[in-house]
Amino acid sequence: QSPIFGPQDVSSIEGNSVSITCYYPDTSVNRHTRKYWCRQGANGYCATLISSNGYLSKEYSGRASLINFPENSTFVINIAHLTQEDTGSYKCGLGTTNRGLFFDVSLEVSQVPEFPNDTHVYTKDIGRTVTIECRFKEGNAHSKKSLCKKRGEACEVVIDSTEYVDPSYKDRAILFMKGTSRDIFYVNISHLIPSDAGLYVCQAGEGPSADKNNADLQVLEPEPELLYKDLRSSVTFECDLGREVANDAKYLCRKNKETCDVIINTLGKRDPAFEGRILLTPRDDNGRFSVLITGLRKEDAGHYQCGAHSSGLPQEGWPVQAWQLFVNEESTIPNSRSVVKGVTGGSVAIVCPYNPKESSSLKYWCHWEADENGRCPVLVGTQALVQEGYEGRLALFDQPGSGAYTVILNQLTTQDSGFYWCLTDGDSRWRTTIELQVAEATKKPDLEVTPQNATAVIGETFTISCHYPCKFYSQEKYWCKWSNDGCHILPSHDEGARQSSVSCDQSSQIVSMTLNPVKKEDEGWYWCGVKEGQVYGETTAIYVAVEERTRGSPHINPTDANARAKDAPEEEAMESSVREDENKANLDPRLFADEREIQNAGDQAQENRASGNAGSAGGQSGSSK
């Protein structure tokens, strides 16, 4: 008796796909050992067709896959485009050789069934419409026409030309003739349901001179498309239900025992479990739409169905498309915080992972909005202008090679609470969802800037100080000038390593920035922040206004402005003559030709790439005192 288990007999027809699940005992060795699928030969040798080591035989090229699900102690073999040559005896098994633990599987692939010559076969999916063609001779042109359904020996009338319609086909069946045709009539049956399947006979005339045609109607449940996705990645369900339902409400539902629970529909319904991580996007006027779900969880695995009906709910006899989603827990996507908490007036630094192989991809951050079908307008990106309302308080810091970028949002308000997505123009699986929760602040912020009303005078020296608590003592402090393409850290150089101090005077922890001399282009937002290596922490922002010197304005002596720098050993001062090149860049709509749920962030095109790199001086010069 083998401890491996699976289906003993699998039967399908040519052109179809099979998905064979093999179950193995839940042990560490089994979870990680080689999985294989081989074909049993007459000589007793079992030839490997596919294995988890990456081997794929020539005859399976482009049509088969083997996926291990260690968390379920299963592996799945998918084989598409079946032919009768695939009929045979196989083994699914575990081990370094094909003689280890295995289970015998018999696969039988049949031809599509044939019917007698006078039988026309109609194959339709549930919810679709069939048009049955009925030919007759001229002698029956004026005779009664009918369609009946065989039930045993009897044939029960479905519809006839006297306007009789069987109650179970009411509003679904019509009998008609096209144009001037004198030898053919048609019966349309719409909103097909499984019980409509069977043998039909259409007839023109009565008695021995009647003309009869046989029609075999097969009504198929949609075969689910199998989707294999990693934990924390995203999935897109592409739904194409046809023109006939273009104007009906669309939905995506998840099969739950006997019902199909709507996750999202175009009438505004949305399952709370998918809040912040789902978008429904119409694709065209023909009823095509897509549903994107990010931040996949283990419990998202299951059977999904999209459909259309005026109610926005599943309805028997309406077209559907089906998927089975598998969520693999062995994910390449790192676990990142799904909830980030901030306080009003404070800041948050959100780390967004991306595929490390795509470090040159464009990075974006968008705000998920619940209205209608959900949308996610881009707020900031490596080539996108910061959206209105976020100027001076939002920046994206790319960290090439680290597999992550950081988005910092400061001057938080409770209106900033909500869901945000990290995404790139590269690997679409690497989309992460973050919920930002902003609470009312109950204490003073950790970083405070003085003076708070910052107005600098052209030609003079201007110093601004940032007070930080002792807990930031060992962290790197920085000032940066915010612009539409990031916050460029003002250059500085340490004059010798600072002496570590056993005691920390809370009042004297200051990092200062000096503009000397002030120029008109120095006007703008400045951030004071702390970081450790590439890990960004708290920030605070201040707007520095620049004005011409008026006759009565006091002249500040540069030495006085920096006097505190000599008195406070813990203070770091940065002096900068800031030259900012404001590279205003845009999100190119072509990047998302297929992903229109991400809203375009601006309306100017920009060729040169804006850099949001922490530490890039962007043409600034200055020195640290």
Partner: nanobody, 127 residues
């Protein structure tokens, strides 16, 4: 109201044959998996055989103890399930239950993976 009704049980001599049938009515779906389980007196319900459907592909599963002796068949659209039992043994004596589930998902041997159940039909193998 969902009903699964089993029939075909009875008393049979060792080595004999029986055919069990199950008809499901009121199911809100064309069942994607149907199965037979057996419960001998004082024992747990045990998996016997199952059939799963995905589109026009069927998957048949058997317990080791019945392989080669029992054959499961069914019709997804008609919601029917049959079990042809040959070469019956005294240890096959049990109450046989029909079970149905909307998805061909999860381990078919686990009774918890089925939502609907019949009342059972008794099979007794004795000389």
């Amino acid at each position: 109201q969902v009903q699964l009704v089993e029939s075909g049980g009875g008393l049979v001599q060792p080595g004999g044959s029986l055919r069990l049938s199950c008809v499901a009515s009121g199911l809100p779906f064309s069942s994607s998996r149907m199965a037979w389980f057996a419960q001998a007196p004082g024992k747990e319900r045990e998996f016997v055989a199952a059939i799963g459907w995905r589109g026009r592909t069927s998957y048949k599963y058997y317990a080791d103890s019945v392989k080669g002796r029992f054959t499961v068949s069914g019709d997804n659209a008609k919601k029917t399930l049959d079990l042809q039992m040959k070469d019956l043994k005294p240890e096959d004596t049990a109450l046989y239950f029909c079970a149905a589930h909307p998805n061909d998902d999860g381990d078919p041997r686990i009774s918890g993976n089925y939502q609907y159940w019949g009342q059972g039909t008794q099979v007794t193998v004795s000389s």
